[in-house]
């Protein structure tokens, strides 16, 4: 019999956590697990519980996490890694749309995230989408071109800036930008 199947690991309500705000990491395996082990990678920290409640997010808790479980003497495969990001570590960038936030269906628009600091990484989030568009770009600026806009592109966008040297410490989100597709 092969290795035990991997558990799932999720962050609730989100893996993007403002400093000082709460978050819960939850490891979920099959029923009847003997022992869970939740660990922070690139560190030696772990706990033998399926749930880690963080009442106030700190910089030192940002990073990659994974979990496993044990039944008898057998360990499961590890879960997929979870990236826990602390936001609000740096001042917010500004997000703008070129040529403007109102665009005709079929047209082109570029969302641009700008910061005064020397960050080399930017992430763009559309409200309701689970994952960001990450774009390693030139220092001080990141462009996210949207070619051939459709109605599905309309919505509220925010961007974050951060450094590749500390990839789990992000800025506060930009003010929201409403993209209107006509």
């Amino acid at each position: 019999s092969g290795p035990l199947p991997k558990p799932s690991l999720q962050a609730l309500p989100s893996s993007l956590v403002p400093l000082e705000k709460p978050v819960t990491l939850r490891c979920q395996g099959p029923p009847g697990v003997d022992l869970y082990r939740l660990e922070k990678l690139s560190s030696s920290r772990y706990q033998d519980q399926a749930v880690l409640f963080i009442p106030a997010m700190k910089r030192s808790l940002a990073g990659r996490y994974r979990c496993s479980y044990q039944n008898g003497s057998l360990w499961s495969l590890p879960s997929d890694q979870l990236e826990l990001v602390a936001t609000g570590v740096f001042a917010k960038p500004s997000l703008s749309a070129q040529p403007g936030p109102a665009v005709s269906s079929g047209g082109d628009v570029t969302l641009q995230c700008q910061t005064r600091y020397g960050f080399d990484q930017f992430a763009l989030y559309k409200e309701g989408d689970p994952a960001p568009y990450k774009n390693p770009e030139r220092w001080y600026r990141a462009s996210f071109p949207i070619i051939t806009v459709t109605a599905a592109h309309s919505g509220t966008y925010r961007c974050y800036s951060f450094s590749s040297r500390d990839p789990y410490l992000w800025s506060a989100p930009s003010d929201p930008l409403e993209l209107v597709v006509t």
Partner: nanobody, 129 residues
Framework: QVQLQESGGGLVQAGDSLRLSCAAS????????MGWFRQAPGKEREFVAA????????YYADSVKGRFTISRDNAKNTVYLQMNSLKPEDTAVYYC??????????????????????WGQGTQVTVSS
């Protein structure tokens, strides 16, 4: 509680390799952070390397980074230190040690040197030029 016994030390030439082993007795081996330390004659004991419970994370002193590799086999209750490109300044007694990990609410990711609770007797490594 865990008992530790090092082996694999010896006399080698500069540039050679050596692999140290540390056998642990005790059923909770996989609960511990395992580390290697060394003490050269007339010097303080210094940290060399550490490895997390699963082996998924490692941490090295700058002086050995890129030359030494720490690993562990939880099924065999053993931790290893592979030492390559040895230098005369690596000459020391090498100790294996075990520690509980810091909690998630600590501000540090690895046990501090004084937090290693269990120690082996040491094995001598001599590197001649």
């Amino acid at each position: 509680q865990v008992q530790l016994q090092e082996s694999g030390g010896g006399l080698v030439q500069a540039g050679d390799s050596l692999r140290l082993s540390c056998a642990a007795s005790g059923r909770t081996f996989s609960s511990y952070v395992m580390g290697w330390f060394r003490q050269a004659p007339g010097k303080e004991r210094e940290f060399v390397a550490a490895i997390s419970w699963s082996g998924g994370s490692t941490y090295y002193a700058d002086s050995v980074k890129g030359r030494f590799t720490i690993s562990r086999d939880n099924a065999k209750n053993t931790v290893y230190l592979q030492m390559n490109s040895l230098k005369p300044e690596d000459t020391a007694v090498y100790y294996c040690a075990a520690a509980d990990p810091p909690s998630f609410y600590s501000d540090y990711d690895w046990p501090r040197d004084h937090e290693y609770d269990y120690w082996g007797q040491g094995t001598q490594v001599t590197v001649s030029s």
